[in-house]
């Protein structure tokens, strides 16, 4: 089976690497524009230069291309706790990240939020906090993990998942309650 190619990919595949087929004349292969530039005018004929112009401030192209416009630079989203790691240049988009002792949680492919790494109070660090993953905590006896924090078993209700981890404590509480009734 031949994989389906988009129109642009079909056109490009006729020309050697680094060139693209002229949109008005499919017998001409034009040289692609370097990263940091965009296509202003197609080459007038075979062996003649493509007219490429440098991206304006606030825009970029990160690879060789025949785009009619540069791409807009991304902005780091302050409301998501993001900070700028490196600013946008003509050939590279803005790089956003998180502050020290924070990790990225991706809500979708192109949206992340910064959260503080868990400190594992009342527990121990099983896996250290990483760029895209919170600390993994193991809780001390008498504590259970809820929303990545070690919470006292005294806060464990019978209906919650913590009952297995906190079973001795629950039985103890139940026993104390029972002994108080006649």
């Amino acid at each position: 089976l031949v994989p389906h190619l988009g129109d642009r990919e079909k056109r490009d595949s006729v020309c050697p690497q680094g060139k693209y087929i002229h949109p008005q004349n499919n017998s001409i292969c034009c040289t692609k524009c370097h990263k940091g530039t965009y296509l202003y005018n197609d080459c007038p004929g075979p062996g003649q230069d493509t007219d490429c112009r440098e991206c304006e401030s606030g825009s970029f192209t990160a690879s060789e291309n025949h785009l009619r416009h540069c791409l807009s630079c991304s902005k780091c989203r302050k409301e998501m706790g993001q900070v700028e790691i490196s600013s946008c240049t003509v050939d590279r988009d803005t790089v956003c990240g998180c502050r020290k002792n924070q990790y990225r949680h991706y809500w979708s492919e192109n949206l992340f939020q910064c959260f503080n790494c868990s400190l594992c109070l009342n527990g121990t660090v099983h896996l250290s906090c990483q760029e895209k993953q919170n600390t993994v905590c193991t809780c001390h006896a008498g504590f259970f993990l809820r929303e990545n924090e070690c919470v006292s078993c005294s806060n464990c209700k019978k209906s919650l998942e913590c009952t297995k981890l906190c079973l001795p404590q629950i039985e103890n509480v139940k026993g104390t309650e029972d002994s108080g009734t006649t």
Epitope: R77, E79, Q113, F115, E147, N148
Partner: nanobody, 119 residues
Framework: EVQLLESGGGLVQPGGSLRLSCAAS????????MVWVRQAPGKGLEWVSH????????FYADSVKGRFTISRDNSKNTLYLQMNSLRAEDTAVYNC????????????WGQGTLVTVSS
């Protein structure tokens, strides 16, 4: 007590429009980033859009960009989602929520409003 109450869902034909509202109370609405998420039948939660407190530079998921518009009226403590050019794949329960702060889970969100896109 934080309360979020969505309304405006319903049955609409493909290509049609709906406007969802979310009435908020129990917190300082004007200080919070607000979020619309949705869950299609048998699917996971999808982040649709969010809007910062000042209403500037909202975020849209690629799947709704150019079709949906998020807005807010801080004087009315209300969040909106204008949905145009609706498609069958937009069928879902839509919830408004406060942007999480402590971790990647929603502490506060509404009961949801069902949007069904069908001919």
């Amino acid at each position: 007590e934080v309360q979020l109450l969505e309304s405006g869902g319903g049955l609409v034909q493909p290509g049609g429009s709906l406007r969802l509202s979310c009435a908020a109370s129990g917190f300082t609405f004007a200080h919070e980033t607000m979020v619309w998420v949705r869950q299609a039948p048998g699917k996971g939660l999808e982040w649709v859009s969010h809007i910062p407190p000042d209403g500037q530079d909202p975020f849209y998921a690629d799947s709704v960009k150019g079709r949906f518009t998020i807005s807010r009226d801080n004087s009315k403590n209300t969040l909106y989602l204008q949905m145009n050019s609706l498609r069958a794949e937009d069928t879902a329960v839509y919830n408004c929520a406060l942007l999480p702060k402590r971790g990647p889970w929603f502490d506060y969100w509404g009961q949801g409003t069902l949007v069904t896109v069908s001919s």
